[in-house]
């Protein structure tokens, strides 16, 4: 009935603010308009992200968290809406923004890439594994020679700053290594990486990038690959990679390369063993790699190949461990 009422006016929210609450994370907050009549009606809000990347959504709440790079600034608008089955009434927009941080674009880092690895934990008995993080980047083309870069990551609510850097010839940080982190790929949380910089000659523009832990996780190679030859058969066996994921979470790819004729046999497997027929005149190179599969998480990319094991002519009954 209200929607059909000519005089009914929807008023925009008030006190709309945007606040950076963490690396690459902002909190949008607003209040319902105190002058809004019929405040008992089921009001909603239409949020529009204008920059850095356009997005829009509806919410009943009066705050909203956004995870996005902030080095180009952030701008958003919000309006009050009232929906019915056949029409939507909307107020005017209110807008707010976070200004882009100072610095010339050419001074910020470029080509930021990050990868995570699962490694044995010597640190605490609670979990036998920990996740390391390595990030590399290129110095900005317009960055003065005295520029120094500093990297931070945020995963969930926790933020860590880098303590171990690799440097270029001018002593500028160009890579960072965290031996252990709190990163995991259990949920949908994104990894936020922030690199800021300092120089006596210019303002260095910071840079933010978001990564999916799933996409940057480098699965370890399968362990203890063993190969045995019996008559004209190759018996290949291996153990799951060093990983927090249990056995049933892995798919494997096996590569058997005939070094004599160049033929490559590839097998996709769920099991951790395989038998293959071979001739008795060729030498073979065997490698295995792994990928985490569903239902343990969304399928990830293939990990590194295990070291090649060579068997065959003049290498009968060879067993190698890696």
């Amino acid at each position: 009935d209200l929607l059909n009422h000519k005089k009914f006016l929807l008023l925009p929210p008030v006190n709309f603010t945007i606040k950076a609450t963490g690396l690459a994370q902002v909190l949008l907050h607003w209040d319902p308009n105190p002058d809004q009549e019929q405040r008992h009606v089921d009001l909603e809000y239409h949020v529009k992200i204008n920059a850095p990347q356009e997005d829009e959504y509806d919410t009943r709440k009066t705050e909203s968290k956004c995870v996005t790079p902030l080095h180009e600034g952030f701008a958003a608008s919000v309006r009050t809406i009232l929906k019915s089955s056949h029409t939507t009434l909307a107020s005017s927009w209110v807008s707010a923004e976070l200004k882009a941080p100072p610095g010339s674009p050419g001074t910020s880092v470029t080509n930021l890439t990050c990868t995570t690895h699962t490694v044995v934990s010597s640190h605490t008995h609670l979990r036998p594994y920990q996740v390391s993080l390595r990030c590399t980047w290129l110095v900005g083309k317009d960055a003065p020679e005295d520029t120094q870069y500093f990297l931070y990551y945020r995963f969930g609510v926790l933020t860590e700053k880098c303590q171990e850097y690799s440097r270029d010839a001018l002593n500028r940080n160009t890579a960072c290594w965290f031996p252990r982190t709190f990163i995991n790929s259990k949920g949908f949380e994104q990894l936020a990486v922030h690199i800021n910089g300092s120089s006596k000659r210019a303002a260095i523009k910071p840079f933010d990038q978001l990564f999916s832990p799933l996409a940057i996780d480098q699965v370890n190679p399968p362990r203890n690959v063993t190969v045995e030859i019996e008559s004209n058969s190759l018996y290949i066996q291996w153990e799951k990679p060093l990983s927090a994921f249990p056995d049933h979470c892995f798919n494997y790819e096996l590569k058997i390369y005939n070094t004599k004729n160049g033929h490559i046999q590839k097998e996709k497997l769920i099991a951790n063993k395989f038998i293959s027929k071979i001739d008795d005149v060729s030498t073979y190179s065997i490698q295995v790699r792994a990928a985490v599969s569903s239902p343990c998480r969304m399928p990830g990319r293939w990990g590194e190949w295990s070291q090649p094991i060579y068997v065959g002519k003049e290498r009968k009954s060879l067993v190698e461990w890696h």
Partner: antibody, heavy 117, light 106 residues
Framework: VQLVESDGGLVQPGRSLKLSCAAS????????MAWVRQAPTKGLEWVAT????????YYRDSVKGRFTISRDNAKSTLYLQMDSLSSEDTATYYC???????????WGQGVMVTVSS | DIRMTQSPASLSASLGETVNIECLAS??????LAWYQQKPGKSPQLLIY???SLQNGVPSRFSGSGSGTQYSLKINSLQSEDVATYFC????????FGGGTKLELK
């Protein structure tokens, strides 16, 4: 692993108090540390957490701006500076070891802080 | 913030009985859940972490299970020394505890 909190005591509303926690039996700088409190006959409430080197600190909303967690890795000691105390802050305060997204695996014996006039 | 709802608030059980305590998270915590035991006048002790991993030195009659938002602690063959208050805790997004379950002997 041992965590030993300093004496608490009775403090008037609006006043300040600083708690300390001496750690031993492990490499202090290898762990995040936290303060957790428990009001009389009530449940447990996380108060604050600090990162390895003290560069990052996290607080529950009700203590933000009033409490400051800090650490001295050279002395293997954790601190909690509590300002503008109110009766709602009356509790046993525990210092606890953890490591980011981990549970609290070791706890101190706890120290009672009573805020009353 | 994630809210943890523990039930029951208190329970009485006989020696040798099996006890179950439930914990419900307000959102998925991806098994980032711990259980603690607290005896009167003592500090809490970690029993279970990552929903189902037993902490060193904890008797095997304690076990944890669950995933997503629903978790439980099971005590098989209740002993007199198990009389205590039990708390669940999530550590997926900050750190929040359930309200506790006071376990008494019948």
């Amino acid at each position: 692993v041992q965590l030993v909190e300093s004496d608490g005591g009775l403090v008037q509303p609006g006043r300040s108090l600083k708690l300390s926690c001496a750690a031993s039996g492990f490499t202090f700088s290898d762990f995040y540390m936290a303060w957790v409190r428990q009001a009389p006959t009530k449940g447990l409430e996380w108060v604050a957490t600090i990162s390895y080197d003290g560069s990052s600190a996290y607080y529950r909303d009700s203590v933000k701006g009033r409490f400051t967690i800090s650490r001295d890795n050279a002395k293997s000691t954790l601190y909690l500076q509590m300002d503008s105390l109110s009766s709602e802050d009356t509790a046993t305060y525990y210092c606890a070891r953890h490591d980011g997204y981990y549970p609290f695996d070791y706890w101190g014996q706890g120290v009672m802080v009573t805020v009353s006039s | 913030d994630i809210r943890m709802t523990q039930s029951p608030a208190s329970l009485s059980a006989s020696l040798g009985e099996t006890v179950n305590i439930e914990c419900l998270a307000s959102e998925d915590i991806y098994s980032d859940l711990a259980w603690y035991q607290q005896k009167p006048g003592k500090s809490p002790q970690l029993l279970i972490y990552d929903a189902n991993s037993l902490q060193n030195g904890v008797p095997s009659r304690f076990s944890g299970s669950g995933s997503g938002t629903q978790y439980s602690l099971k005590i098989n063959s209740l002993q007199s020394e198990d009389v205590a208050t039990y708390f669940c805790q999530q550590y997926n997004n900050y750190w929040t505890f359930g309200g506790g379950t006071k376990l008494e002997l019948k």
